[in-house]
């Protein structure tokens, strides 16, 4: 059962796993959610009735029954982890805590103009978990405007104390705001010989890399495969760090793989979601339950639905035994990973999918692309919406993309002459315009947010957000697309598609069925040559064939230029403008979304 509200002046008795320090009960709840075993927590707020050494303590708790006895205690705030909830969760915390000093290892001290600059410094420093900034009003003259970058083993402060005229906050790496290099390579036959901060068992290097990414201290990893000569080290995932943040020594060793934390590539890759099945593989751990199940997929579902289950092993039924049902072993451990991995015993193992909601919804798999043809099929582009105006009569106005459960990203030029959001309707999960009838459900628009530097499409800033009146429930036919991550600025996208119900030639009409076209990206330099009379800025991106023939056109505006990279779809562009449609040597010009990620996050995450 999902309980989101916090219980004031209430303490949960017993079940303690560990104690951490957090600046608020809200953040304590997030820490509990991300902890592999925590189901409940008790936070102690600052209070004159409470011993100051206990202020800001966040006690993480577990219980077989998923609840614990409640006791009244002033200044205690208790609650439940979001593991029990189906909504999406994020570790991103932009809050700034005034008059709080979050203690950790102070490894870097420098002068900064503001707390925001200090936070940016922390976000762009590979080791930084959180910071404390002494403001201009700080009593000690030589400490004023000093920005202290800090880290700890757990990623949370070792203590929090009251201190006048300082502010503290966390790194925004988990908000996808880091400019640190994103290094995606996995190096075969490589061991990184730096200090290990932790080790876990993993079935493959990809799971090992994802564990490294969400481990607060891990910067790179080495994984020993099941063919590794030393039996005791097989499937061992070594989580590593170094002072420089980079591996100091690389040793060539067969059957080992090494790679990097993807913390600066966040939001465009699944980090928590290990969705693969591992055949002829048994995961060992503490047994939670043994249940009969028809298949390994059914076993994974059972594990996902059992809040304490972290991973499972399924043993298929022996012929005609137990109505063809096999045994599903639901398991857990202290760190969420198997305690041992065995091969050759016939089991099929995997992980709970409960943690997938901690990844951006946009990273989950969608229907495979239909190759050839120009008409899309249902569910092929689940982020694509059709934006209708009802004035003077109802018609398709523009395309748009779902980027959050209350947010559509589209083009600013769509709203020329639109006086009020009241006349707009957003339809999602639509393949054919003819499906839209009087009684078809739609999302009303609460607010239109147009970039304040927008003047006209050709001069850039052609971007707008629509805040919906109600939230979108994600399904196979309506779900978000990932924004490109700033850490991925240098990805060269080769699989890009433009979609929309727009004209198929310059003088035409809106199409009934959603159309798609695969279109190559064009360098800005090449694009500039084709548009001598315009300035093609870095905030624009171009796509098109030199010979023309495929392009976006009238009515596609605001829709997505979607590019697939590492099995994840990214919203690389927003259909903006072009000279004619599909003309030779006249590529389409799109808003370059990666350049507006900060703007999008600022507008969508504003309180």
């Amino acid at each position: 059962e999902c309980v989101t509200q916090l219980l004031k002046d209430t303490c949960f008795e017993g079940g303690d796993i560990t104690t951490v320090f957090t600046p608020s009960a809200k953040y304590c709840q997030v820490v509990c959610t991300y902890h592999p075993r925590c189901l409940l927590f008790t936070f102690t707020a600052e209070s004159p009735s409470e011993d100051p050494t206990r202020w800001f303590t966040c006690v993480l708790k577990d219980s077989v029954t998923e609840t614990l006895p409640r006791v009244n205690r002033t200044a205690a705030i208790s609650g439940y982890s979001f593991k029990q909830c189906s909504h999406q969760i994020s570790a991103c915390n932009k809050d700034i805590y005034v008059d709080l000093d979050m203690k950790g290892i102070n490894y870097n001290s420098s002068v900064a103009k503001s707390a925001q600059e200090c936070q940016e410094r922390c976000t762009d420093d590979v080791h930084c978990h959180f910071f404390t900034y002494a403001t201009r009003q700080f009593p000690s003259l030589e400490h004023r405007n000093i920005c202290l970058l800090k880290h700890t083993q757990t990623g949370t402060p070792t203590r929090i104390t009251k201190l006048d005229k300082v502010v503290s906050g966390f790194s925004l790496k988990s908000c996808a705001l880091s400019n640190l290099a994103c290094i995606r390579d996995i190096f075969p036959n490589t061991v990184f010989a730096d200090s290990n901060i932790d080790s876990v068992m993993a079935p493959d290097a990809f799971v090992c890399g994802r564990i490294c990414t969400h481990h607060p201290g891990c910067l790179f990893f080495t994984f020993f495969s099941q063919e590794w000569p030393k039996e005791s080290q097989r499937n061992l995932c070594l989580l590593k760090t170094s002072e420089s943040g980079l591996p100091s020594t690389r040793i060539k060793k067969s059957k080992a793989l090494s790679g990097f934390s993807l913390q600066s590539c966040r939001h465009s890759i699944p980090v928590f979601c290990h969705s693969s099945f591992y055949h002829d593989t048994d995961f060992l751990g503490e047994e939670l339950d043994i249940v009969a199940a028809k298949s390994h997929e059914a076993c994974q579902k059972l594990c996902t639905n059992a809040v304490r289950c972290q991973f499972f092993t399924y043993t298929p039924a022996q012929a005609s035994c137990n109505e063809g049902k096999g045994k599903c072993y639901l398991k857990l451990s202290s760190n969420g990973s198997p305690t041992k991995i065995l091969h050759g015993r016939g089991g099929i193992s995997g992980y709970t999918l409960r943690l997938c909601k901690m990844d951006n919804e946009c990273t989950t798999k969608i229907k495979p692309r239909i190759v050839g043809g120009t008409a899309s099929v249902r569910g092929e582009w689940p982020w694509q919406v059709t934006l209708h105006t009802t004035s003077p009569t109802q018609r398709h106005l523009c395309g748009g993309s779902i980027i959050g459960n209350q947010w559509i990203l589209t083009a600013a030029h769509c709203f020329y002459g639109v006086e009020s959001p009241k006349i707009l309707r957003v339809y999602s999960g639509i393949l054919n315009q003819s499906e839209i009838k009087e009684d078809t459900s739609f999302f009303g628009v609460q607010e239109i947010i147009i970039h304040d530097q927008y003047k006209m499409a050709e001069s850039g800033y052609d971007i707008a957000l629509l805040k919906l009146e109600t939230t979108v429930n994600y399904t196979d036919s309506q779900r978000p697309i990932c924004l490109p991550s700033k850490g991925d600025r240098n990805v060269i996208y080769t699989d890009c598609w433009v979609t929309g119900w727009g004209y198929r030639k310059l003088r035409d009409k809106i199409q009934n069925t959603l159309q798609k076209a695969k279109i190559p990206l064009v360098t800005n330099e090449e694009c500039q040559k084709r548009y001598r009379g315009h300035k093609i800025t870095h905030k624009m991106i171009c796509a098109g064939y030199r010979e023309g023939g495929k392009d976006a056109c009238k009515g596609d505006s605001g829709g997505p230029l979607s590019c697939k990279h590492n099995e994840v779809w990214h919203l690389v562009g927003i259909t903006s403008w072009g000279e004619g449609c599909a003309q030779r040597e006249r590529p389409g010009v799109y808003t370059n979304v990666v350049e507006y990620v900060d703007w999008i996050l600022e507008k969508t995450q504003a309180v």
Epitope: D124, V126, N179, A181, S244, G245, L246
Partner: nanobody
Framework: QVQLVESGGGSVQAGGSLRLSCAAS????????VGWFRQAPGKEREGVAA????????YYADSVKGRFTISQDNSKNTVYLQMNSLRAEDTAVYYC?????????????????WGQGTLVTVSS
């Protein structure tokens, strides 16, 4: 003593090409970030291209994408910047820099070691 030495600069017509080299002594490019930066008169130093030498991951400023290519020769401990389709606005002193930490690849403030620079002049 760490030394980075740039070479290959000079004058070229718009549309032409140049190849800059950066040779290091006392510092190994392997396992580190190496960047090319430039500074035009009266302007701030800006990142042009960077490479993480271990895997060869490359990073480029939008203004040079598709025109400039950064590459490395680990055996010679040298990094190159191939510059094609040069424009007048590419005129600047080009610096090679080495980082000793994981960095935002095009942020000059985070690089530790710097060369003396080589002048590139593009005339239109």
């Amino acid at each position: 003593q760490v030394q980075l030495v740039e070479s290959g600069g000079g004058s070229v017509q718009a549309g032409g090409s140049l190849r800059l080299s950066c040779a290091a002594s006392g510092y190994t490019f392997n396992n580190n970030f190496v960047g090319w930066f430039r500074q035009a008169p009266g302007k701030e130093r800006e990142g042009v291209a960077a490479i993480y030498s271990l895997g060869g991951s490359t990073y480029y400023a939008d203004s040079v994408k598709g025109r400039f290519t950064i590459s490395q020769d680990n055996s010679k401990n040298t990094v190159y910047l191939q510059m094609n389709s040069l424009r007048a606005e590419d005129t600047a002193v080009y610096y090679c820099a080495g980082a000793i930490t994981w960095v935002p690849p095009l942020s000059h403030r985070r690089y530790t070691y710097w060369g003396q620079g080589t002048l590139v002049t593009v005339s239109s």
